[in-house]
């Protein structure tokens, strides 16, 4: 049974199938425009810029913090503004941040245990296999890029981020100085969390305390629990219990309708958030732009490498990932990284991939047909071990490193600093402080100096939004992948593999209109398990 | 083979400039930095700071700001220090170094060293 | 600026004597640990980095150990020509420090 469609002006519906299979019902200019395609009159123009509103309303909210935060900086900046207004002009920012961050821990734990349970052991198996490579793969590619520019382009070489004194190094103190085996044996315990509810808010790291055995100072390592939510190992333990629902078989359905119902109950809270991003967005951007000083200091010492850095995120989001994702689809990838401008903006202005997963949810959902089931099993596990903007990044800053010091890399510490950057970035959710700390981790390994990693973290700021949008990018594109994969399997298949868990929801609610893309259809098995129902979910805005 | 040559030993008065210098031979200069080192008798071995062969660019220690400069002339493969306005807590043995390549900060080969004497 | 201490400033052996020289950094320098030769005419020369890795043309009776602070050159054969001021540096962050050396006569 389905439900009405909602109708536009003219009366008119249209059924299209989406890309999960099922029947997207919304009219023909809408989905054209909804799509970022051509729209010709002025009716079309309105509905096209109705569609579109939010997509642009981020966009400009990007622009306008730049503006603002350069306007203000120019009266002054933070010494002018004083502390307590900096801190109320950043406000709002911070207002955003708090609102995605109150949402990660319902969203990442409900998606993946409904995710996990919707999928039978095998298709989990493959789904999850396949992202994993692709994760993988893009990151490794991600890694050999940015090698590859930093070893052209020389940022480190003919820098003068070095030209003061060995104090502009940095105090080698600030460097972090971890071993490398105890960073990845807190990665494995943080993938075992031994309390769940302090893994919400709590990850363990392992820090050092000199002490005095038989007259020598010995560096004994001691474990502690450190502010910051252990997401690695609540995304384990969320997809472990969802395989353990599902073995329940009816047992289990109840727990699994409540978790499939809190989260639906979440992505309407994110709806709700999704039109307040723009807003906050706005002052993140400008805040940090605020707060900086002498940014053209700091862009003339490290120009090159910022270039660097911006110039390999740009080429591996704009030309290499699109590139895997029509060689693997044959569709227009551009169309699809439209439909995800809103948390694109939203990883620029927050800098968190695990604040920006409730809106590239929606997004990819609502706007590029990805199937609930793959898009809430996928992005969370994205968020948590696909880094290819920090790989990319780590792997540029380690070349840059080299050339300011002056160390030659042969062939075997290129393909040192390439593994470890890619192994590192997929643990560095498991890491606190991750992205220095990783970085220090391929110094070491490749006997590098960690002195001017404070040069790196000066600029880190501006970086790190670049690394976040290209995280999530890839993350959004594997799903997006992933949805292709799935639908030419159940293509060739008469029975279809991947099955969802039904909601203790009416099959017909009433539709409720939205502007933020299609209805989402999910597909539920009948009762006798034979026949397919396809039932419309509103998007609450 | 690598070699290191430093010009010869230097008698300053107070407030004069002098002029150190470093040939190298036997690699290719631009590949490895340049550091120097001061030797004092009562202070033992101080790291003044090094030169960047490839770019030029100088990167002093904090006792080395200010009377000190740290130069190239590539074609030749040669590296200078200057100190100007000597003082007579100059007086020492100055060496260049070969920063080497692989292990964060050692020195693989060194100058022979200059004996600068600052004497009123 | 990380300390780098020579406990002993002069040591006398005998020829064919087995000699360890100690060195302790102020904090963990990660095994960044090099030692020089100073002969008695001014020359230096390196003869062991990254604690125990020997330079070319050093002779193998020289050998290096030591982790985390605490570090030592051991000659295992003394000779002669190993008469000399024997130096450490730390070789983990800048700027690199020097100890204050050991100076080995011959009894």
């Known amino acids: 049974m389905v439900a009405d469609p909602p109708r536009d002006s003219k009366g008119l519906a249209a059924a299209e199938p989406t890309a999960n299979g099922g029947l997207a019902l919304a009219s023909i200019e809408d989905q054209g425009a909804a799509a970022g395609g051509y729209c010709g009159s002025r009716d079309q123009v309105r509905r096209c810029l109705r569609a579109n509103l939010l997509v642009l309303l981020t966009v400009v909210a990007v622009v306008a913090g730049v503006a603002l935060g350069l306007g203000v900086s120019g009266a002054g900046g933070a010494l002018a503004l004083g502390p307590e207004r900096l801190s109320a002009f950043v406000f709002p920012g911070e207002l955003l941040l708090r609102l995605l961050r109150m949402i990660i821990l319902p969203l990442v734990v409900c998606s993946l245990i409904g995710g996990a349970a919707s999928l039978d052991p095998g298709a989990l198996g493959r789904l999850g296999a396949w992202a994993l490579l692709f994760f993988l793969v893009t990151t490794l590619l991600a890694s050999a890029l940015g090698v590859g520019l930093a070893l052209a382009l020389q940022p480190g070489a003919a820098s003068a981020a070095i030209n003061a004194s060995v104090g502009a190094a940095g105090s080698a103190e600030n460097a972090p100085s971890k071993e490398v085996l105890d960073s990845f044996l807190d990665l494995a315990r943080n993938i075992f969390p031994s309390n769940l509810v302090s893994a919400a808010f709590r990850s363990y790291s392992t820090t050092y305390e000199e002490r005095n055995i038989t007259g020598t100072r010995v560096k004994v390592p001691v474990g502690q629990e450190v502010e910051g939510m252990n997401i690695l190992g609540l995304v384990v333990f969320a997809i472990v219990f969802g395989v353990a629902l599902r073995k329940l078989g009816p047992e289990g359905e109840l727990l699994i309708r409540f978790f499939n119902s809190f989260n639906e109950a979440t992505m309407v809270l994110v709806s709700w958030i999704m039109w307040y991003a723009p807003v906050g967005i706005m002052f993140l951007v400008a805040g940090k732009i605020v707060e900086m000083e002498d940014v053209g200091l700091l862009f003339a010492r490290l120009g090159k490498y910022i270039l660097c850095c911006l110039l390999g995120h740009a080429i591996h989001g704009l030309l290499v990932l699109p590139l895997i994702y029509f060689l693997f689809t044959r569709k227009n990838p551009y169309r699809f990284l439209w439909g995800i401008v809103t948390p694109l903006a939203t990883a620029f202005g927050t800098s968190s991939s695990s604040a920006t997963l409730p809106l590239m949810m929606k997004c990819v959902e609502e706007k590029n047909g990805v199937a609930k089931h793959i898009s809430r099993f996928i992005l969370p596990i994205g968020a948590t071990v696909n880094m290819d903007g920090a790989a990319l990044f780590q792997c540029v800053a380690a070349v840059f490193i080299a050339q300011l010091s002056q160390q030659s890399l042969d062939f075997v510490k290129i393909i040192t600093i390439l593994v470890t950057a890619t192994a590192s970035s997929v643990g560095a959710a498991g890491i606190p402080a991750g992205g220095v700390l990783t970085l220090a981790i391929i110094l070491e390994a490749v006997n590098l100096p960690v002195d001017h990693i404070s040069l790196i973290l000066a600029v880190d700021w501006l970086v790190d939004r670049s690394c976040t949008v290209l995280n999530v990018e890839g993350d959004a594109l594997g799903a997006g992948l992933l949805q292709n994969y799935v639908d030419r399997t159940e293509s060739r298949s008469t029975e279809p593999e991947l099955i969802q868990v039904k909601s203790e929801l009416p099959l017909d609610p009433l539709p409720v209109p939205t502007e933020e893309g299609n209805p989402l259809l999910k597909h539920y098995r009948g009762p006798a398990g034979d026949a397919t129902v396809a039932s419309e979910k509103e998007s609450v805005m | 083979q690598i070699q290191l040559v430093q010009s010869g030993p230097e008698l300053k008065k107070p407030g004069e400039t002098v002029k150190i210098s470093c040939k190298a031979s036997?690699?290719?200069?631009?590949?490895?930095?340049m550091s120097w080192v001061k030797q004092t008798p009562g202070k033992g071995l101080k790291w003044m700071g090094w030169i960047h062969t490839y770019s030029g660019v100088p990167i002093y220690g904090d006792d080395s700001k200010g009377r000190f400069a740290f130069s190239l002339e590539t074609s030749g493969s040669i590296a200078y220090l200057q100190i100007n306005n000597v003082k007579n807590e100059d007086t020492a043995t100055y060496f260049c170094?070969?920063?080497?390549?692989?292990?964060?900060?050692?020195?693989?080969?060194w100058g022979q060293g200059t004996t600068l004497t600052v004497s009123s | 600026d990380i300390q780098m201490t020579q406990i002993t400033s002069s040591l006398s052996a005998s020829l064919g004597d087995r000699v360890t020289i100690s060195c302790r950094a102020s904090q963990d320098i990660r095994n960044y640990l090099n030692w020089y030769q100073q002969k008695p005419d001014g020359t230096v020369k390196l003869l062991i980095y990254y604690t125990s890795r020997l330079h070319s043309g050093v002779p193998s009776r020289f050998s290096g150990s030591g982790s985390g602070t605490d570090y030592s050159l051991t000659i295992s054969n003394l000779e002669q020509e190993d008469i000399a001021t024997y130096f450490c540096?730390?070789?983990?962050?800048?700027?690199?420090?020097f100890g204050g050396g050991t100076k080995l006569e011959i009894k």
């Open positions: 540096q730390q070789g983990n962050t800048l700027p690199p420090t």
């Open positions: 170094a070969r920063r080497s390549d692989g292990y964060r900060y050692f020195f693989d080969y």
């Open positions: 036997g690699y290719t200069f631009t590949t490895y930095g």
